[in-house]
Amino acid sequence: APMGSDPPTACCFSYTARKLPHNFVVDYYETSSLCSQPAVVFQTKRGKQVCADPSESWVQEYVYDLELN
């Protein structure tokens, strides 16, 4: 994020390199445009937050499925 700006609660330094099991993912949010890079944050059943690359096809697929549900 630009110095001096206040990003929202979470940004991502980088992205996971593995595809999460579909049934592990229960929710998601997109990080703010104030963050230095775009990211999708998946919430897992265990309450973990996982940073993912929004340009990856599996990430787009999971987001689509979560929106449907």
Partner: antibody, heavy 120, light 110 residues
Amino acid sequence: QVQLKESGPGLVAPSQSLSITCTVSGFSLTGYGIHWVRQPPGKGLEWLGVIWPGGGTNYNSALMSRLNISKDNSKSQVFLKMNSLQTDDTAMYYCARGPLITTEVSMDYWGQGTSVTVSS
Amino acid sequence: QAVVTQESALTTSPGETVTLTCRSNTGAVTTSNYANWVQEKPDHLFTGLIGGTNNRAPGVPARFSGSLIGDKAALTITGAQTEDEAIYFCALWYSNHWVFGGGTKLTVLG
């Protein structure tokens, strides 16, 4: 449980290179970054760099020309290589786990460190 | 490269509240610096306490809290315990790299 363990040569001659391995367990390198940090005797911490799950790296700009960080996900190992060592590179060298999200502690679990002495 | 400054040493007593601070020479510390606090205990035992300015790591006692106070990051220990005697390092993120402060040696008399 989460564990990180550094292994290194102990003694390095001036102008030679340093190679340290960080072996991790209890988590996957595909889901976390690994930071390298050093502490000269009696001094504070200096961040050296980080390797992210996809293999991308960030480095301390003052040391970038001498540093290389790489990894082998299948062996759960991360490697630090530093060239052209001088006596002021004498330090304890640590690896630390790096979560990807900014709302978590960015170096949450640390290894016990490996001592490196640069001397002829 | 940025320089991050901490008090070199502080002394407190059990039960007292003590605040350690972390200043950047580039200007005010903001939430974009994702201030972290790391504790060093004897025998090179490091533990991450606080991340993202004010988020406690799992298992870290509630007496440890992080915040921004004025133009600095701060670590407050509310009701210090003798086991809190340690060296505390802050670390600030500058777009693509971390910089550590010099550390604060906290003595808890008692």
